[in-house]
């Protein structure tokens, strides 16, 4: 794959209601089975068809789950994270990190490579600066007419 791959990272609060087949997604990760090197985070590995998460539509494969009902998922064994979900109750609030791939060249699937990504302001600041420069140049041009 050519070009540098960067990730636009956004966070979202997703509230799911446990369905007949649970929350309807799979997880990987934990301190004992890192999904990404040097990152013990919990990642969504599969969205089950017609499950609670699929019907809600916001959770995606490759998303990192930061907390469950306000409880941090940092530095947990995989089974401890599973137990948190198991005991989370009927209404489950997830704090989720989405990663949107932005790169020069073909787009690969999410969930590979460096999970840290780039903060949204690092994309927005240059865009804002360019807009301001363009507006200034336009005003100068109009004054000369």
């Amino acid at each position: 794959m050519n070009g540098r791959v960067d990730y636009l990272v956004t966070e979202e609060e997703i509230n799911l209601t446990r369905g007949p087949s649970g929350l309807g997604f799979n997880i990987v990760g934990g301190t004992d089975q890192q999904y990404v090197s040097n990152d013990s985070g919990i990642y969504v590995s599969r969205i089950k068809e017609n499950g609670a998460a699929a019907l809600d539509g916001r959770l995606q494969e490759g998303d990192k789950i930061l907390s469950v009902n306000g409880q941090d998922l940092k530095n947990l064994l995989h089974q401890d994270a599973v137990d948190l979900f198991r005991n989370a109750g009927y209404a489950v609030s997830l704090r989720v990190q989405h990663r949107l791939q932005v790169q020069n060249g073909p787009i690969g699937h999410r969930g590979e490579g460096d999970p840290s990504g780039i903060p949204i302001f690092m994309v927005l600041v240059p865009v804002f600066a360019l807009t301001m420069v363009a507006a200034w140049a336009f005003m100068r041009y109009r004054q000369q007419l």
Epitope: V28, Y35, S37, R46, H109
Partner: nanobody
């Protein structure tokens, strides 16, 4: 449905090398863990090495420095390069595809197994 097909097993002398391959087909998803397990007669199946689609690897202590796991995400394949083989490495090696723990009623691992390939070190 997921299918895993192993190849590359065989008979080799102690100190020799083998390269096992496993090709996965079906709905394996983009986020998964592929690995190799082995099972000696009368013993439990044990992890040899695994690699995630995110690039993290894990090895059994007994094979560290001798075996190397790698994968080709585009081909949905995983490989195990086995060097400095010992007679105690003799057994059946199984390919495994793990799609994580399902947060449903059962909370079971969502995983699949190949039929196995025999490795014999004389």
């Amino acid at each position: 449905q997921v299918q895993l097909v192993e190849s590359g097993g065989g008979l080799v002398q102690a100190g020799g090398s083998l390269r096992l391959s496993c090709a996965a087909s079906g709905s394996i998803g983009s986020i998964n863990i592929m690995g190799w397990y082995r099972q000696a007669p009368g013993k439990q199946r044990e992890l040899v090495a695994s690699i995630t689609s995110g690039g993290a690897t894990n090895y059994a202590d007994s094979v560290k420095g001798r075996f190397t796991i790698s994968r080709d995400n585009a081909k949905n394949a995983v490989y195990l390069q086995m060097n400095s083989l010992k007679p105690e490495d003799t057994t059946v090696y199984y390919c495994n595809l793990d799609r994580g723990t399902h947060l449903g009623d059962s909370f079971e691992r969502d995983d699949y197994w190949g039929r196995g390939t025999q490795v014999t070190v004389s």
